[in-house]
Interface confidence: medium
């Protein structure tokens, strides 16, 4: 049984309808909580703005792959 209604619950109720340039993205996190209406990806941009995106869209998947590779590649 969850102990809090709201604390640490973040949901996406709608998705952006614009593709965001991968150069503008800093990180992402997946939203899979059963408290939320749909699975989602929250991208954080380089100016720290968070935007909801649909994980089923190809550009979202590609962006996540790109960010994953960025974090795996050691910076020289």
């Amino acid at each position: 049984q969850p102990d809090a209604i709201n604390a640490a619950v973040t949901c996406c109720y709608n998705f952006t309808n614009r593709k965001i340039s991968v150069q503008r993205l800093a990180s992402y996190r997946r939203i899979t909580s059963s408290k939320c209406p749909k699975e989602a990806v929250i991208f954080k941009t380089i100016v720290a703005k968070e935007i909801c995106a649909d994980p089923k869209q190809k550009w979202v998947q590609d962006s996540m792959d790109h960010l994953d590779k960025q974090t795996q590649t050691p910076k020289t």
Epitope: N6, Y13, N14, P37
Partner: antibody, heavy 128, light 110 residues
Framework: QSLEESGGDLVKPGASLTLTCKAS?????????MCWVRQAPGKGLEWIAC????????TYYASWAKGRFTISKTSSTTVTLQMTSLTAADTATYFC?????????????????????WGPGTLVTVSS | AYDMTQTPASVSEPVGGTVTIKCQAS??????LSWYQQKPGQPPKLLIY???TLASGVPSRFKGSGSGTEYTVTISGVQSDDAATYYC????????????FGGGTEVVVK
């Protein structure tokens, strides 16, 4: 569009009581809660508990209410509050309220709830 | 534990004046704050949610503001119909919470 509480009564200390909240014409979407709030005579509002009106039926309690109060969703339009070991301090009007979630687009939002619909209340008096 | 402290406990203002009610949370509640109006013998009525958004049908003379731990509701051009008790409520967390409501502020309109 209404909520109506029933079951309030005059009971003796130590007794148990079950209150019922019946909804009419209220939309219980997956992202709303049914809650109980009480108010002792001449005092402020005191949140007791909420139950998720969606499929999960998850329950949430004020720290003081855990163990002695039990909220349950008994049907798609009915919620109950079971109260045990009642004392004079439990004397109050008990309100049923819908907690609704608000959000913004397309930015992430925490589940922000406010009680947007209330019943008229039912009076519980605990006295010997 | 997200305790809500409301001030003042009571305020008296003539018709047309301005009433300001403050609500302080013991920890940041990130704008997860609502305000309610309650008249004697009636259930509370939602006025403001998400700290500053007016609920449907609420007159524009009510204004909510604040952030972090400090929040305010202001009634400008107060009317006799505004005489009531006002409560704030945090909805940031229900974990280990004793009460999500503030203690209330009685508004008397002279």
């Amino acid at each position: 569009q209404s909520l109506e509480e029933s079951g309030g009564d005059l009971v003796k200390p130590g007794a148990s009581l079950t209150l019922t909240c019946k909804a009419s014409g209220i939309d219980f979407s997956l992202y709303s809660y049914m809650c109980w709030v009480r108010q002792a005579p001449g005092k402020g509002l005191e949140w007791i508990a909420c139950v998720d009106a969606g499929a999960s039926g998850s329950t949430y309690y004020a720290s003081w209410a855990k163990g002695r109060f039990t909220i349950s969703k008994t049907s798609s339009t009915t919620v109950t509050l079971q109260m045990t070991s009642l004392t004079a301090a439990d004397t109050a009007t008990y309100f049923c309220a819908r907690g609704i979630l608000y959000y913004t687009w397309p930015y992430p939002a925490g589940a922000i709830d406010a009680f947007d619909s209330w019943g008229p209340g039912t009076l519980v008096t605990v006295s010997s | 534990a997200y305790d809500m402290t409301q001030t003042p406990a009571s305020v008296s203002e003539p018709v047309g004046g301005t009433v300001t009610i403050k609500c302080q949370a013991s920890e940041s509640i990130s704008n997860y704050l609502s305000w309610y109006q309650q008249k004697p013998g009636q259930p509370p009525k939602l006025l403001i949610y998400k700290a500053s958004t007016l609920a449907s049908g609420v007159p524009s003379r009510f204004k909510g503001s604040g952030s972090g731990t400090e929040y305010t509701v202001t009634i400008s051009g107060v009317q006799s119909d505004d005489a009531a008790t006002y409560y704030c409520q945090q909805s940031y967390s229900s974990s280990n919470v004793f009460n999500t409501f503030g203690g209330g502020t009685e508004v008397v309109v002279k």
